[in-house]
């Protein structure tokens, strides 16, 4: 999947299986990623587990779990708030669009989480205060999570180079350049660009991610995934100057 | 091994809404030098770990990218402490503890928020 870290680094990761997205003293988020096509290096998120840890008189420990085709509007115990404690309403789940869009507000840690199902796969977005991000007691074991550190260098796909190659070859198929076997209905480059431009008129990294996903999978739902990811940034990011990220020289590698 | 604390302090010094050190300012280079110093201090206890080597290479990359000199001023991170997680022995009747922004305002101005997202393939 594509990852935008807390430090506004943008990476495309081929991480497969279960990985920690967030792991601090208050919250643990784990994602499971699966290949989008058999034998593909590119992966997308098929499962998401969020554990809200027991916190003072506010909330009991609550677990939220979403999977492909199952986006519940409740915690695994069936509840929709933080339990029986005095401040239980400081943790709330709201269903925005049935089976497609859920928002979780954790006011006791100033955090908002948006989970969506777009096509077959899940997307995740979070707004969190710096000090909650940094509330890690044991940096050695907790500090290596994806949102903070990015994904390991050997798990990254250079999709910007892929995009440049694609542009240069026009409509020709890019089986050699592609990190995945050619999808059965892969779009020609021009079609992918047109579809992405419809939803993402600004040629930023979200637009490039969209083009990459269409060329890699042929699944038009990934256009919506990129579109909603950007919409979530607009809603959740505190720095409005950083909504759009653009291709630039090599950044600090997110090697975890 | 405290290397990830160095990463966090660098991140804290270069992000957030309180006059963040943007990539092209002297503050960014100062933050990088602090990061390099912090990293060097962890070498004894972290040198065999991936996170240490990642940080070292990352700093080198950024130093050259932004033409930062190795010598010069360093910066201080901005950090504040949250109450401990888990059940506390002290109970408060005030619901403020369960409202982060209200409890935060007691200590300082608006908190610095940040964002992480995961989508697509």
């Amino acid at each position: 999947p594509h990852l935008r870290t807390f430090t506004d680094r943008f990476q495309t990761c081929k991480v497969q299986g279960a990985w920690p997205l967030i792991d601090n003293n208050y919250l643990n988020v784990q994602v499971t990623n699966t290949p989008v096509l058999p034998g593909s290096a590119a992966t997308a998120t098929s499962k998401l587990t969020i554990i809200f840890k027991n916190f003072q008189e506010c909330v009991d420990q609550k677990v939220y779990q979403a999977e492909m085709d199952e986006l519940p509007a409740a915690f695994v115990d069936g509840s929709k708030n933080g339990g029986d404690k005095h401040g239980a309403n400081s943790l709330k789940i709201t269903e925005k669009v049935s089976g497609q869009h859920v928002e979780i507000q954790a006011k006791y840690i100033g955090t908002t989480i948006v989970v969506r199902q777009v096509g077959r796969y899940l997307t995740f977005a979070v707004r969190m205060p710096e000090e909650v991000v940094n509330a890690v007691e044991d940096w050695d074991s907790q500090g290596l999570y994806l949102c903070l550190r990015g994904c390991p260098l050997n798990q990254q796909i250079d999709f910007q180079a892929f995009h440049t190659n694609a542009e240069g070859t026009g409509a020709r198929r890019l089986a050699a350049a592609s990190p995945a076997p050619t999808a059965p209905e892969t779009f020609p480059y021009e079609t992918a660009v047109a579809k992405c431009k419809e939803k993402l008129p600004v040629e930023d990294l979200y637009y490039q991610a969209c083009v990459f996903d269409l060329l890699t999978t042929g699944d038009v739902n990934f256009t919506l995934a990129a579109y909603y990811a950007l919409e979530d940034v607009k809603m959740l990011h505190s720095n409005k100057d950083k909504l759009h990220l653009y291709e630039r020289t090599r950044d600090l590698p997110g090697r975890a | 091994c405290k290397i990830l604390k160095c990463n966090s302090e660098f991140w804290s010094a270069t992000s957030g809404s309180h006059a963040p050190a943007s990539d092209d300012t002297p503050e960014f280079c100062a933050a990088l030098r602090s990061y390099a110093l912090c990293t060097r201090r962890t070498a004894r206890t972290c040198r065999g770990d991936l996170a240490y080597h990642s940080a070292v290479h990352g700093i080198e990359d950024l130093m050259s990218q932004h033409n930062c000199s190795k010598d010069g001023p360093t910066s201080q991170p901005r950090l504040r402490t949250l109450p401990p997680a888990g059940d506390s022995q002290e109970r408060s009747d005030s619901p403020e503890i369960c409202h982060y922004e209200k409890s935060f305002h007691k200590h300082s101005a608006t908190p610095n928020y940040t964002h992480c997202g995961l989508f697509g393939d």
Epitope: D140, S141, L144 | R41, R44, T45, G48, D49, A51, H53
Partner: antibody, heavy 115, light 112 residues
Framework: EVQLVESGGGLVQPGGSLRLSCAAS????????MNWIRQAPGKGLEWIGM????????HYADSVKGRFTISRDNSKNTLYLQMNSLRAEDTAVYYC????????WGQGTMVTVSS | DVVLTQSPLSLPVTLGQPASISCRSS???????????LEWFQQRPGQSPRLLIY???SRFSGVPDRFSGSGSGTDFTLKISRVEAEDVGVYYC?????????FGQGTKLEIK
């Protein structure tokens, strides 16, 4: 939960060889340097050596240099200690420990060198 | 190699009473940056060592706050404010400042 399980210990004659394994779980093994430490019966702790996360560097105590080799297989989450030219004074419980600075230790495996 | 000398080698303590273990180094453990890499481990009978304190005074996660570390340069101390039955075992100091990593010879804590 971090878990380290050593195996491969046993009785071996002086001059013989033995290979110890340490199976790691509960953390990202490939991110960490790893150590071997031993403890002779009724005695204190002695550091044997360490290996970097990617095997790029290995460091050994003088007492085992040239006889012992540390290796790792990150795909199997396993650390190894190959011990050659064993001596009676190598008799000890051998522990593997996580991190450049050992924090979590395994339960140990006993190696007895005796004729 | 850096030699760490612990004292006493045996420490009988009454339950609920404080205990103190000393660790002396043959050379300073302070780096040029002012950091000191001295750790303390506890080894209960029949168990493997467990990290208690790192960098002189930082408690490792899950370690009760009755354990504290202090010191600088060449002289270091591990204190237990109120000894409990589960504290019985051997305590080792270890230094990481200089290669190779070395341990003290151990202090055996027992209940009187």
């Amino acid at each position: 939960e971090v878990q380290l399980v050593e195996s491969g210990g046993g009785l071996v004659q002086p001059g013989g060889s033995l290979r110890l394994s340490c199976a790691a779980s509960g953390f990202t093994f490939s991110n960490y340097g790893m150590n071997w430490i031993r403890q002779a019966p009724g005695k204190g702790l002695e550091w044997i050596g360490m290996i970097y996360y990617d095997s790029s560097e290995k460091h050994y105590a003088d007492s085992v240099k040239g006889r012992f080799t540390i290796s790792r297989d990150n795909s199997k989450n396993t650390l190894y200690l190959q011990m050659n030219s064993l001596r009676a004074e190598d008799t000890a419980v051998y522990y593997c420990a996580k991190g450049t600075t050992p924090d979590y230790w395994g339960q140990g495996t006993m190696v007895t060198v005796s004729s | 190699d850096v030699v760490l000398t612990q004292s006493p080698l045996s420490l009988p303590v009454t339950l609920g009473q404080p205990a103190s273990i000393s660790c002396r180094s043959s050379q300073s453990l302070e780096t040029s940056d002012g950091d000191t890499f001295l750790e303390w481990f506890q080894q209960r009978p029949g168990q493997s060592p467990r990290l208690l304190i790192y960098e002189v005074s930082s408690r490792f996660s899950g370690v009760p706050d009755r354990f504290s570390g202090s010191g600088s340069g060449t002289d270091f101390t591990l204190k237990i404010s109120r000894v409990e039955a589960e504290d019985v075992g051997v305590y080792y100091c270890m230094q990481v400042t200089h290669d190779p990593l070395t341990f003290g010879q151990g202090t055996k804590l027992e209940i009187k």
